[in-house]
Structure formats: C-alpha cells, structure tokens
C-alpha cells in the first residue's frame, strides 16, 4: 500500500482535532460524500462510517451492484472502477454459479 | 471465521509502558482498520485510535495522541497497541476490534 | 461532558417494550453519522446489536430495532427477556473531534 504518514496527513501523532485546514480528506478519512475526498478516492462504506477509500485500478476486484433492492446493505464497501475501467466478470474466472463470478476493473 | 485473539493480562507499575497484541485470522488483514477501545471497571467504553492494517497509517483520539502507538506487522497478521507512562487509571480492559467482530480483551492493570 | 448521552439505567417486566436514547449533536448524530448499537454482558466483549441506525446482523432476534432522528437515536427492546439484562452503548463518529465516540451506557435490568 502507499505509506502515507496519517489518515488525514498530518503528522503521525496528530489526532485532526484541528480544523485548520480544509484540505480534501485523505485514505481513512471519515466522509458523508466523495466531494469530501480527495482526488483517487470515493466515500465508501467502511461499517462504523464511510471513510475515503482509492478507486479501483485495472484488475482491481470490484463489486458488480444486482439490480436495486437485490442486495442487503454493504457494510464493507469497495470504490467503484477509474476513469476507463468498467466492472466486467473476470474471463478467466470460472464458477458453477453467476452470483459467484469474480469481477474485476477492466478496459472498456 | 473471523477470531481477534489478544495477548494476555499485563500487571505494570506506574511509569512504565505496556504493549498489548491482537492476532487475526480468517480474513484478508491487509483489507481492514483495527481500532483499539478501553474499558475501565465499571465504566463505559473509549475509543483510542485505529491503524490501517495495510499501509501502517494511524489516526489517535486527541487524548492519547501523547502516550500511544499503533502499530502492525503484516507477516503475522498482528496488530499492536503501546501505551506509555502509565498511570492507575489506565487499568482498564483493552479490546481490539475490526469494527464488526472484537478481540475478548486484555486486562491491564496499573498499580505500584 | 459525554458526546452520545444516554440514560444510565432502565428497566422493564418481561414482555415489555423498552426503549434507550442516545442523544447526540449537530457535530455526531445530526450530521448524518451512523449510529450502531453493542451490547455487552458482564465481562464479555461488546457485541453488535444494531448496526448503521436500523440494521440487524444475523443471529440478533427482531425483538430488537434501532432508529435514528435528527440529533438522537433510539434501541428499542420488544418483548423483553430475562437474558437481555446487560450493559448497552450508541456509538457513532464526531466530526469535531475527529474521533468515533460511545455513549455513556445504559445499565438494562429485567424485573422480577
């Protein structure tokens, strides 16, 4: 992973008490909306609150949503695909049921 | 099965530092935060901070920003808290949680 | 003073409906922050009751429900049972304190 020094760039024994600066918040933050994060990141789930979390990358795993109402609620959510990147079942990845599937960011 | 399964009670003097660990199995390590949540006897429960099992990164409650590192090592899929400079009102139960399943505890008590 | 305030006791026969508040402010609970519900049995870690303001993990009956509204939350307990005696906290997060917060606990005690 990239080793930033805090969740919201501060000096590592910072506790972001402080709202000094109104910087875009940074992996780990705590968010309501992706506006409150910066770029690479969207606000999703992380059960106790909604934290910035990095947009999937090519080959990243990713979550393919069912049709609305078909799912329970994600307490563990993943970003969605980068610019370019859609989430597609994984070609090589064969299961004996379509639910299983693997699916990964892949190119358009 | 997700377990969370603490190192042992810990009876330190004043002054001194105590470091409590927390090994998980049953999922991906790297994947999740591990916040760590002290309860002293007969009183509620207070977050101290979490560290993000992947990259090492670390956000403290205000309070112990002074006396407390999170840390982890990957290779073992074990999470660690240290608290320094103990004082009597630090005896308290300390749990690890990865939010949604808990470690059961480990008691540290500060007497001289 | 506590973030999340709740009442430190209550009780109910069995059978009867309780209800615990969780009163919060315009920094945690009103500002659209999750609340999620533990409860804890003496000696034993916190476990999850009610999770992001009304949901329900597996294996927690539908006797429990929570809710939310503007500053505050609620758990309520339908059809109380002598094994639902225990210690119980809202949580949330604080975007003033940039900390997750508990609420002071609520000591629950079934009558007779």
């Known amino acids: 992973g990239n080793d930033h020094s805090t969740l919201d760039g501060y000096s590592r024994r910072t506790t972001l008490s402080s709202k000094m600066y109104h910087s875009k918040g940074q992996e780990g933050s705590v968010c309501l909306r992706s506006s409150d994060c910066a770029t690479g990141l969207c606000c999703a789930r992380h059960f106790w609150s909604k934290i910035c979390k990095p947009v999937l990358k090519e080959g990243q795993v990713c979550t393919k949503h069912r049709r609305k109402g078909s799912h329970g609620l994600e307490i563990f959510q993943r970003c969605y695909c980068g610019e370019g990147l859609s989430c597609r079942i994984q070609k090589d990845h064969h299961q004996a049921s379509n639910s299983s599937r693997l699916h990964t960011c892949q190119r358009h | 099965e997700v377990q969370l399964v603490q190192s042992g009670a810990e009876v330190k003097k004043p002054g001194a530092s105590v470091k409590v660990s927390c090994k998980a199995s049953g999922y991906t390590f790297t994947d999740y935060y591990i916040h760590w949540v002290r309860q002293a006897p007969g009183q509620g429960l207070e977050w101290m901070g979490w560290i993000h099992s992947n990259s090492g990164a670390t956000t403290y409650a205000q309070k112990f920003q002074a006396r407390v590192t999170m840390s982890r090592d990957t290779s073992s899929s074990t999470a660690y808290m240290e608290l320094s400079r103990l004082e009597s009102d630090d005896t308290a139960m300390y749990f690890c949680?990865?939010?949604?399943?808990w470690g059961k505890g480990t008691m540290v008590t500060v007497s001289s | 003073q506590a973030v999340l305030t709740q009442p430190s006791s209550v009780s109910g026969a069995p059978g009867q409906r309780v209800s615990i508040s969780c009163t919060g402010s315009s920094s945690n609970i009103g500002a659209a922050y999750d609340v999620h519900w533990y409860q804890q049995l003496p000696g034993t870690a916190p476990r999850l009751l009610i999770y992001v303001n009304n949901n329900r993990p597996s294996g927690v009956p539908d006797r429990f429900s929570g809710s939310k509204s503007g500053t505050s939350a609620s758990l309520v307990i339908a059809g109380l049972q002598a094994e639902d005696e225990a210690d119980y906290y809202c949580q949330s997060y604080d975007n003033s304190l940039n900390a997750y917060v508990f609420g002071t606990g609520t000591k629950l005690t079934v009558l007779g």
């Open positions: 949680s990865r939010e949604d399943y």
